[in-house]
C-alpha cells in the first residue's frame, strides 16, 4: 500500500488551531515533476457533506512530502469529509478523514467501519442531544433509511447493513429530521472486496494474517498497519510517537500522538495513534490494553508487562506476542519482511534460525505460495544460529505472494512469512526521441514509457548504422538525462534502441523498438568573400562573390545572402540555390537605406562561415513622374514631346530620361537623356517614317524617379530610313504647354 497518512489535530477548543496534515513516506512524493509523479493534494470534499461557505482554507507545503491545511475559522468549517491524494500512476491513493462536530445531536460510536464482503455492518449513532423526532440515515448524501425516535436502543440509533458489498462503501450519516446537517453523525464504511482473510481478483489468495489490528488489502494482500506498527504482518511496534510504514515519521508536539487522528489508505480507515483512544484521541489506554484506539489486549504471560504502545514486553527467555514462546523453542531470526526479485531469475534465499536443540539443515524449509516446499541446498552453522540457503527455481509471476520459512525441532516450531515481489524487467514501449542532430552527433531523449516495473536504475542506448551488421555500440546513461551520441558519420542513418534496467540481478529488460535517426550533412567550411556590388536602381543591387579554391568537390548546396537594415532592425535573406552561382540580383530593397551585406555557403540545413561584411548605401528614391506627357509628329522623322515638371520635388532635377520604343517591337528600348532640366519640351529626331512609337519619361535628382504615363505617336509618311532617333530640347512656349 502507498505510505500515506492523513493526520487530524483534534484539540478542538479553538478551531483556528485545528489542522490537517498529509504525510507521504513514498520516495519523491509531492515534488510534482514528471520524474517524481504528481504532488500531494489535500482538500475538503464538499460533494456529500456541504457546509456554509467560509474563508478559503490555507494550504502549506512543508518540504516534498508533507502538506498542511489550516485556516478554519469556526467549528462548522471542520465538519465533513477531507481527503488527501498521493502516490503516482496506478499507486495514486486517496485517504479520507471524516470529521464530526463534538456538539452534534448525534455522535458516531465509531467513525470508521471496515468490514469484509458479505458481513453485516452495524453503524451506531449515540444520542448526544435528544430530539423527539425521526432519524434519517443517508448514504453518500442520498436517502437510505428512517428510524422513529422511539426505536433508539440504549440511547443509540443503529443501522444494520446485512450482506454488505463493495458498492455499499461510502459516507453514511444519521440526522434528526429537522436538525441541521452539521448536527449529523457521520460515518465511513469501507467494504473490502473479499471475504475475511482473502484477497486477490477472485479472492482466492490467503491474507498473511495481519497482526495488531492491521487490515489485509483486498487488491495486493499487503497489511495496512495501524499507526505505530510496521512489518509485513504489522508484527513490529514503532517507538512511541512514531508512525509511517517504516516508523520514519514523528508525531508533532511535546505530547506525541495525543489528540491526533490517523487516517491511512483503505481498507484501514482512521483511528487514534497507538496508545490513545476516545473521540478526540486524548485518553490513554486502560491497563492491559494497547495499540491504535486501545483496541488490543495484552494478555501477557510468563511475567510479561503490557506497554500501551507496543504490547507485551517479555522478560528474558521468552518471546512471542503474549510472551508465550520459550526461547528454547526454535525461532526464525532477522527474516526480511519483504524481498524483491526480477522475473526469471534464480535467487538464493537465506533463512536463519536458533533454538535448543539447535536447528540443522534439514529442519529448515521454505514454502512457496503455491504450497511447493523447497529444501535447503546448504547450511552455515554458527554458534548462535543456523543459516539455511535455498536455491530458488526460475521465478515466474505466480511466485509473487507470501512465502514462509519454517523451522521444526523437537523443541517446537516457528515460522515466519515474508512477501516476495516478483518484478517484471521494464521494456520500452516506444522508441527514443531525437532532440537535435549535427553532422557527427545526435542528442537523444532515452526515457520513454515502458511496460513492466520500475524504478529504472540504468538506461542503455544501443546504436549502429542502418543496415549494418556490425556490433551495436552501447552507452549507459542516467535515466533522467538526455544522451549525446558522438563521433558519428555525417549524413548517415543510425538505428537506435533503448534498453531499460531495474535494480537487482536479472533486471535488464528486452530492447525497445528501433528508430531511425539520421545525422546531418557535413558543415560547409569555405568562407566566401564579396567581390563587388553595384546599384542598378534605387531598390536593386547586383552582388558578386568568390570562393577559395580547394581540391575535391564543393561541399554546399547554395548560398545565403543576408542584408541587415540596422536602422529598422530588419534582416533580408536571399537564397541562391546553385552552388555554382557567383552573382545575384537583389530587388525590392528600400531606397536610401544603408545595408550591411554578407554571404555564406550552406549545405542541407547547416551554414558555413559568413564572408566579411560589406556596407552598401542605396540611393534614395527619385522624384515623382513628369506630368501631362504629350507627343506630336513634326515630320516623317521627328516627334516633339512636351510635359510639365513633376510636383512636390525634393530637390532640383539633374536631368530627364526619355524611353523610346517601337510599338509592338521586340528590341530593347532606347533611353535618351535630356540634360537641361529646366526645359519642358524636346524633339526626338532620326525616327523612321510611318512608324508608331511609344514614349515615356522620368526625372532624376539623386536617383531616377517614377515613369510617367506612356504616350503613342506615329511619324509622318514617305520619309527615308533614318539612322536612329536623337533629340533636341527647348523650353516650351506657353501655347505648347497644353
Amino acid at each position: 500500500a502507498v505510505d500515506l497518512t492523513l493526520l487530524a489535530n483534534l484539540r478542538l477548543t479553538d478551531p483556528q488551531r485545528f489542522f490537517l496534515t498529509c504525510v507521504s513516506g513514498e520516495a519523491g512524493a509531492g515534488r510534482g515533476s514528471d520524474a517524481w509523479g504528481p504532488p500531494l493534494l489535500l482538500e475538503k470534499d464538499d460533494r456529500i457533506v456541504r457546509t456554509p461557505p467560509g474563508p478559503p482554507l490555507r494550504l502549506a507545503r512543508n518540504g516534498s512530502h508533507q502538506v498542511t491545511l489550516r485556516g478554519f475559522s469556526k467549528p462548522s468549517d471542520l465538519v465533513g469529509v477531507f481527503s488527501c491524494v498521493g502516490g503516482a500512476g496506478a499507486r495514486r491513493t486517496r485517504v479520507i478523514y471524516v470529521h464530526n462536530s463534538p456538539g452534534a445531536h448525534l455522535l458516531p460510536d465509531k467513525v470508521t467501519h471496515t468490514v469484509n464482503k458479505g458481513d453485516t455492518a452495524v453503524l451506531s449513532a449515540r444520542v448526544h442531544k435528544e430530539k423527539q423526532t425521526d432519524v434519517i440515515w443517508k448514504s453518500n448524501g442520498s436517502y437510505f433509511y428512517t428510524l422513529d425516535w422511539h426505536e433508539a436502543q440504549d440511547g443509540r440509533f443503529l443501522l444494520q447493513l446485512p450482506n454488505v458489498q463493495p458498492p455499499s462503501s461510502g459516507i453514511y450519516s444519521a440526522t434528526y429530521l429537522e436538525a441541521s446537517p452539521l448536527g449529523s453523525a457521520f460515518f465511513r464504511l469501507i467494504v473490502r472486496g473479499c471475504g475475511a482473510g482473502r484477497w486477490g481478483p477472485g479472492c482466492t489468495k490467503e491474507c498473511p494474517g495481519c497482526l495488531h489490528g492491521g487490515v489485509c488489502h483486498d487488491h495486493d494482500g499487503e497489511c495496512v498497519c495501524p499507526p505505530g506498527f510496521t512489518g509485513t504482518r504489522c508484527e513490529q511496534a514503532c517507538r512511541e510517537g512514531r508512525f509511517g510504514q517504516s516508523c520514519q515519521e514523528q508525531c508533532p508536539g511535546i505530547s506525541g500522538c495525543r489528540g491526533l487522528t490517523f487516517c491511512l489508505p483503505d481498507p484501514y480507515g482512521c483511528s487514534c495513534g497507538s496508545g490513545w483512544r476516545g473521540s478526540q484521541c486524548q485518553e490513554a489506554c486502560a491497563p492491559g490494553h494497547f495499540g491504535a484506539d486501545c483496541r488490543l489486549q495484552c494478555q501477557c504471560q510468563n511475567g510479561g508487562t503490557c506497554d500501551r504502545f507496543s504490547g507485551c514486553v517479555c522478560p528474558s527467555g521468552w518471546h512471542g506476542v503474549h510472551c508465550e514462546k520459550s526461547d528454547r523453542i526454535p525461532q526464525i531470526l532477522n527474516m526480511a519482511s519483504e524481498l524483491e526479485f526480477n522475473l526469471e531469475t534464480m535467487p538464493r534465499i537465506n533463512c536463519a534460525a536458533a533454538g535448543n536443540p539447535f536447528p540443522v539443515r534439514g529442519s529448515i524449509e521454505l514454502r512457496k505460495p503455491d504450497g511447493t516446499v523447497l529444501l535447503s541446498t546448504k547450511a552455515i552453522v554458527e554458534p548462535e544460529k543456523t543459516t539455511a540457503e535455498f536455491e530458488v527455481p526460475r521465478l515466474v509471476l505466480a511466485d509473487s505472494g507470501f512465502w514462509e520459512c519454517r523451522v521444526s525441532t523437537s523443541g517446537g516450531q516457528d515460522s515466519r512469512r515474508f512477501k516476495v515481489n516478483v518484478k517484471v524487467p521494464p521494456v520500452p514501449l516506444a522508441a527514443p526521441r531525437l532532440l537535435t542532430k549535427q553532422s557527427r552527433q545526435l542528442v537523444v531523449s532515452p526515457l520513454v514509457s515502458f511496460s513492466g516495473d520500475g524504478p529504472i536504475s540504468t538506461v542503455r542506448l544501443h546504436y549502429r548504422p542502418q543496415d549494418s551488421t556490425m556490433d551495436w555500440s552501447t552507452i549507459v546513461v542516467d535515466p533522467s538525462e538526455n544522451v549525446t551520441l558522438m563521433n558519428l558519420r555525417p549524413k548517415t542513418g543510425y538505428s537506435v534502441r533503448v534498453q531499460l534496467s531495474r535494480p537487482g540481478e536479472g533486471g535488464e529488460g528486452a530492447w525497445g523498438p528501433p528508430t531511425l535517426m539520421t545525422t546531418d550533412c557535413p558543415e560547409p567550411l569555405l568562407q566566401p568573400w564579396l567581390e563587388g556590388w553595384h546599384v542598378e536602381g534605387t531598390d536593386r543591387l547586383r552582388v558578386s562573390w568568390s570562393l577559395p579554391l580547394v581540391p575535391g568537390p564543393l561541399v554546399g548546396d547554395g548560398f545565403l545572402l543576408r542584408l541587415w537594415d540596422g536602422t529598422r532592425g530588419q534582416e533580408r535573406r536571399e537564397n541562391v540555390s546553385s552552388p555554382q552561382a557567383r552573382t545575384a540580383l537583389l530587388t525590392g530593397l528600400t531606397p536610401g537605406t544603408h545595408y550591411q551585406l554578407d554571404v555564406q555557403l550552406y549545405h542541407c540545413t547547416l551554414l558555413g562561415p559568413a564572408s566579411p561584411p560589406a556596407h552598401v548605401l542605396l540611393p534614395p528614391s527619385g522624384p515623382p513622374a513628369p506630368r501631362h506627357l504629350h507627343a506630336q509628329a513634326l515630320s516623317d522623322s521627328e516627334i516633339q514631346l512636351t510635359w510639365k515638371h513633376p510636383e512636390a520635388l525634393p530637390g532640383p532635377i539633374s536631368k530627364y530620361v526619355v524611353e523610346v520604343q517601337v510599338a509592338g517591337g521586340a528590341g530593347d528600348p532606347l533611353w535618351i537623356d535630356v540634360d537641361r532640366p529646366e526645359e519642358t519640351s524636346t524633339i526626338i529626331r532620326g525616327l523612321n517614317a510611318s512608324t508608331r512609337y511609344l514614349f515615356r519619361m522620368r526625372a532624376s535628382i539623386q536617383g531616377l524617379g517614377d515613369w510617367s504615363n506612356t504616350v503613342e505617336e506615329s511619324t509622318l509618311g514617305n520619309g527615308l530610313q533614318a539612322e536612329g532617333p536623337v533629340q533636341e530640347s527647348r523650353a516650351a512656349e506657353e501655347g505648347l504647354d497644353q
Partner: antibody, heavy 118, light 112 residues
C-alpha cells in the same frame, strides 16, 4: 419506476372488517416509511397510520386507534392495513403513500374505495 | 376539523398569479421546515408539488413556488393555466404526540 398499488377495498357492513394491501415496486421498500391516508367523499385528506421501515414503530390517528392495525412484509414489498369494527365514517378512498427523503409524500397509490354501509 | 387552515376556494384568470395560504401553529408549520403542498385533480391521487417549504420535485413546473412566514405557509401559482384547476392541500409534520402529519382542509382553485 416507483409504483404503489392498493387493493382489498369494497363494501362492508358496520362492525365488519377489511384488510387493505399496497404492493410496492420500483424502489427498496424495506428502507421507507409508509403511510395510509384516506379521503372521505367530497372531503379533504386525513392521515390514518404510519409504519417505519423495520415495522418496529407504528402510529395511528385518534379516529382509528384500537381498531386499525398497520403492518408490512418487507420480503414481499407489501404494506397492509387491517381494519376492524368499521364505522360509516370510515367510508373513504384509502391511499398508501411513501414518505420520501424530503419528508413529504412523494408517491401515492391510485387509492381503493372502502364503503361502510348497512 | 382539519388542523391546518386553508381557504375553501380561490379563483383567478389565465396568466394571473394566485396565492393559497395554509395557517398552522408553532407545533407544526411554525416548528418544522417540512411544509408540503399537493395537487389533486378530480378522480386522481394527490401529487407532490412542493416539499420542505419551497423545494420543487423534478418534473413540477417552476410556476409553482412555496414560502413560509411564521406559522403560515403559502403556495404561489404564477401564470395561471386552465389545467391548474384542482384541489390543493398543504401538509406539515406536527409535534403533537398523537399526530405525525397534519393536512389542511384543501382549497378549490377555479381558473375563470
Amino acid at each position: 419506476e416507483v409504483q404503489l398499488l392498493e387493493s382489498g377495498g369494497g363494501l362492508v357492513q358496520p362492525g365488519g372488517s377489511l384488510r387493505l394491501s399496497c404492493a410496492a415496486s420500483g424502489f427498496t421498500f424495506s428502507r421507507y416509511v409508509m403511510y395510509w391516508v384516506r379521503q372521505a367523499p367530497g372531503k379533504g385528506l386525513e392521515w390514518v397510520s404510519v409504519i417505519y421501515p423495520s415495522g418496529g414503530a407504528t402510529y395511528y390517528a385518534d379516529s382509528v386507534k384500537g381498531r386499525f392495525t398497520i403492518s408490512r412484509d418487507n420480503s414481499k414489498n407489501t404494506l397492509y392495513l387491517q381494519m376492524n369494527s368499521l364505522r360509516a365514517e370510515d367510508t373513504a378512498v384509502y391511499y398508501c403513500a411513501r414518505r420520501g427523503s424530503s419528508g413529504a409524500f412523494d408517491y401515492w397509490g391510485q387509492g381503493t374505495l372502502v364503503t361502510v354501509s348497512s | 376539523q382539519s388542523v391546518l387552515t386553508q381557504p375553501a376556494s380561490v379563483s383567478g384568470s389565465p396568466g394571473q398569479s394566485i396565492t393559497i395560504s395554509c395557517t398552522g401553529t408553532s407545533s407544526d408549520i411554525g416548528r418544522y421546515n417540512y411544509a408540503s403542498w399537493y395537487q389533486q385533480r378530480p378522480g386522481k391521487s394527490p401529487k407532490l408539488l412542493i416539499y420542505e417549504v419551497s423545494d420543487r420535485p423534478s418534473g413540477v413546473s417552476n410556476r409553482f413556488s412555496g414560502s413560509k412566514s411564521g406559522n403560515t405557509a403559502s403556495l404561489i401559482i404564477s401564470g395561471l393555466q386552465a389545467e391548474d384547476e384542482a384541489d390543493y392541500y398543504c401538509s406539515s409534520y406536527s409535534s403533537t404526540n398523537s399526530l405525525q402529519v397534519v393536512f389542511g382542509g384543501g382549497t378549490k382553485l377555479s381558473v375563470l
